[in-house]
């Protein structure tokens, strides 16, 4: 059977978008009107992995782009990354580890905690403009908390 | 009054290691992010390195990458720069910066010169 | 990464002049454009972020426009104090860059 996916746009807890910065990239900043348009798409899959009540093992890909987000090791530490895929055989029920991300559903917030390195989380800073990173700490100064905006097809 | 002050610098050989050092003053240390620029002597400016708030985000140039690490200890209202494997292109004024709005630098430190030479 | 194409890379001027300094990204940079003036021997100060807003403190003979790849600084009525290096820089995406920067001398 086809991976079930959706259409999405995230938010994180202060109300920043999410939008492209580089090729390989994500940033976070408040954005109005027009500017809206900017912000990325992600296609949601729901994929393999251990599964509760609030929590949803789910791949992040951006929409009609093959990229998806995925968290490798970079100098001894777990680094969130865009990486670029064969759209033949993505996405797929079976994602490798570093692609998944456990969604936590909290007091209608969502956390995604990285499936490879557990306890580690999307993350995005309070600052304006500065990139999307995969952060080891929760309740901190950097934001783990978002929300999600469905998308039609 | 917002003040940045770099120490550290010096006199090195290729493949050496130095610290560099900036305390911050007149501001809340904590919350901002903050930068690494370097100019060589009659050049112009070249970002280097860029820390988050709480240390968990950093980034940096390509031509210092794998040699470099920028750090800050929040307790001591200081950020560092440790340079290793030095070459004879990384001489130059090191200034640490503290980020404004969007990813400007609004705020700099004085330098502190790096000179790698045999 | 992107490019950040300053011009002229010099230019004399007198007193008085007004003056206009343009700074190209290789590519869509919005309006995160700052600009820095840097005398000899002193550390670069900011002068303009977001492409058009003027930092606390700046003279408002400072002022810049534009976005997207094509940006503008100008000096409206230059002052002995203003013959300086001045740089653009990008903060759309890392790592960051500066332009040329354009050196401003007496004529």
């Known amino acids: 059977a086809p991976v079930r996916s959706l259409n999405c746009t995230l938010r994180d807890s202060q109300q920043k978008s999410l939008v492209m910065s580089g090729p390989y990239e994500l940033k976070a900043l408040h954005l109005q009107g027009q500017d809206m348009e900017q912000q990325v798409v992600f296609s949601m899959s729901f994929v393999q992995g251990e599964e509760s009540n609030d929590k949803i093992p789910v791949a992040l890909g951006l929409k009609e782009k093959n990229l998806y987000l995925s968290c490798v090791l970079k100098d001894d530490k777990p680094t969130l990354q865009l990486e670029s895929v064969d759209p033949k055989n993505y996405p797929k029920k079976k994602m490798e580890k570093r692609f998944v991300f456990n969604k936590i559903e909290i007091n209608n917030k969502l956390e995604f905690e990285s499936a490879q390195f557990p306890n580690w989380y999307i993350s995005t800073s309070q600052a304006e403009n500065m990139p999307v990173f995969l952060g080891g700490t929760k309740g901190g100064q950097d934001i783990t908390d978002f929300t999600m905006q469905f998308v039609s097809s | 009054e917002v003040q940045l002050l770099e120490s550290g610098g010096g006199l090195v050989q290729p493949g050496g290691s130095l610290r560099l050092s900036c305390a911050a003053s007149g501001f809340t240390f904590s919350k901002y992010f903050m930068f690494w620029v370097r100019q060589a002597p009659g050049k112009g400016l070249e970002w280097v390195s860029v820390?988050?708030?709480?240390?968990?985000?950093?980034r940096y140039a390509d031509s210092v990458k794998g040699r470099f690490t920028i750090s800050r200890d929040n307790s001591k209202n200081t950020l560092y720069l440790q340079m290793n494997s030095l070459r004879a292109e990384d001489t130059a004024v090191y200034y640490c910066a503290r980020v404004g709005y969007g990813g400007n630098s609004d705020y700099w430190g004085q330098g502190t010169l790096v000179t790698v030479s045999s | 990464d992107i490019q950040m194409t300053q011009s002229p890379s010099s230019v004399s001027a007198s007193v008085g002049d007004r003056l206009t300094i343009i700074c190209r990204a290789s590519q869509d940079i919005n309006r995160w454009l700052a600009w820095y003036q840097q005398t000899p021997g002193n550390a670069p100060k900011l002068l303009i972020h977001?492409?058009?807003s003027l930092q606390s403190g700046v003279p408002s003979r400072f002022s810049g426009s534009g976005s997207g790849t094509d940006f503008t600084l100008t000096i409206n009525s230059l002052q002995p104090e203003d013959f300086a290096t001045y740089y653009c820089q990008q903060a759309d995406s890392f790592p960051l860059t500066f332009g040329g920067g354009t050196k401003v001398e007496i004529k």
């Open positions: 820390i988050s708030p709480s240390g968990q985000m950093t």
């Open positions: 977001s492409a058009t």
